[in-house]
């Protein structure tokens, strides 16, 4: 592989690494969306909620003079409950219905697939760099692109979950905004998907420049 190509691959891998960090952050944190109730709902405090793939947290926040609920970073009494995805016999203490359990199960499962693709892609990259097997960058690029797509699907499932929670008559939440975990997931999708495609492009052998050349005449790989 030529020096310029190697440089392009390294820059791409750096972008993919940033995507991996963002994806991991999004998956393990629970600030995908912040939900708030009617402002008149409480006199001095309001009960906002923020949630992720694994749990929902409610927080009693002191209301300011502008009668707004938040920001969620303000100190307050916090109550978190994990979605019991994989032990259906047990029920979550709070918000069993209102969290749209089937949506969070789907989003969490797809996010795990995404992490699986990231691990497979990273293994291929490590083997490629360690043993100079450039051809392993091609499956790695595909794994990263698939990981990006899985993150995108998780994002869309969570968007639908938020919409249903806001629309549901069985919740008090009336307003919402997407928070930093959601932003991390969106950025991770862009970096992983585009990074994967770029890596695939840079790891392909040089196409013949002249009609009489064949792929066999291209620069040999290590």
């Amino acid at each position: 592989m030529s020096q310029t190509k190697m440089l392009k691959v390294r820059v791409t891998l750096f972008c993919i690494l940033a995507g991996i960090v963002l994806a991991m952050t999004a998956v393990v944190t629970d600030h995908w969306a912040v939900l708030s109730p009617h402002m008149e709902h409480h006199n001095t405090t309001c009960e906002a909620a923020h949630f992720g793939l694994w749990r929902i947290c409610t927080k009693r926040i002191p209301m300011d003079d502008s009668k707004t609920c938040g920001p969620i970073t303000l100190p307050g009494e916090k109550n978190c409950s994990y979605f019991r995805h994989f032990n259906p016999g047990e029920s979550s203490e709070i918000f069993e219905f209102t969290t749209q359990k089937e949506y969070s199960i789907s989003a969490a499962a797809i996010a795990i697939f995404s992490l699986g693709f990231i691990i497979l892609g990273s293994l291929c990259v490590l083997l490629s760099l360690g043993k100079k097997r450039d051809y392993l960058l091609r499956p790695a690029s595909m794994f990263y692109a698939f990981a990006g797509l899985c993150i995108l699907v998780s994002v869309e499932v969570m968007r639908q979950s938020v919409k249903r929670m806001i629309d549901s008559e069985d919740t008090v939440w009336i307003e919402y905004y997407y928070s930093w975990s959601f932003a991390c997931a969106c950025a991770a999708f862009i970096l992983l998907f585009l990074g994967g495609l770029a890596l695939l492009l840079f790891s392909l052998p040089r196409m013949p420049r002249n009609p009489w050349e064949s792929c066999m005449d291209a620069e040999p790989e290590h």
């Epitope: 008149e40 008559e169 069985d170 307003e175």
Partner: antibody, heavy 116, light 108 residues
Framework: QVQLQESGPGLVKPSETLSLTCTVS????????WTWLRQPPGKGLEWIGY???????NYNPSLKSRVTISVDTSKNQFSLKLNSVTAADTAVYYC??????????WGQGTLVTVSS | EIVLTQSPGTLSLSPGERATLSCRAS???????LAWYQQRPGQAPRLLIY???NRATAIPDRFSGSGSGTDFTLTISRLEPEDFEVYSC?????????FGGGTKVEIK
Amino acid sequence: QVQLQESGPGLVKPSETLSLTCTVSGDSINNYYWTWLRQPPGKGLEWIGYIYYSGSANYNPSLKSRVTISVDTSKNQFSLKLNSVTAADTAVYYCARGAVKYFRHWGQGTLVTVSS
Amino acid sequence: EIVLTQSPGTLSLSPGERATLSCRASQTINHNNLAWYQQRPGQAPRLLIYGASNRATAIPDRFSGSGSGTDFTLTISRLEPEDFEVYSCQQYGSLPLTFGGGTKVEIK
């Protein structure tokens, strides 16, 4: 399918306390919000207030000083108490599932007349 | 509190005709959080529309909702005999929740 049924006296004397109970069947009272509404004869509906199964409640400011909503999870029931009633409190009282949005599941309603 | 005014008070139409019911709010309703109900005498209200335009489960597609801000409309495209009832609007954009006085749709 969740079903709600209101019960209580149909006649209450002025200045006394109106007490109604809503029994929920077909679903657990847990994890949901439960609301009381009323409709005076020939008039529109009025939201009274709601309670969460944990016991936290919120009321219409116009009735807040007179109203108490409580919940009994063991009996799958929630109740309404309205103090110092007058003829203006004569209405069909409904219980419903939900809190501060729209209401899909309603009881059949019970007419309460305030008269001496 | 938000006051909802429904017009007309009574609407006289024939089966098969189109009914247009209006609900006007005294101030803007946040996020178009408005619901429509149908109420038969001696029965509890039945949810038709929520979020100004979303049809509730099992509601026929002849019922549709539209509008935003302060002006909202419930349209029944072709009136069926069972549609001649009272219709109420309800806002849930701010507390306290409030309801309109209702529009009675009667057979001409």
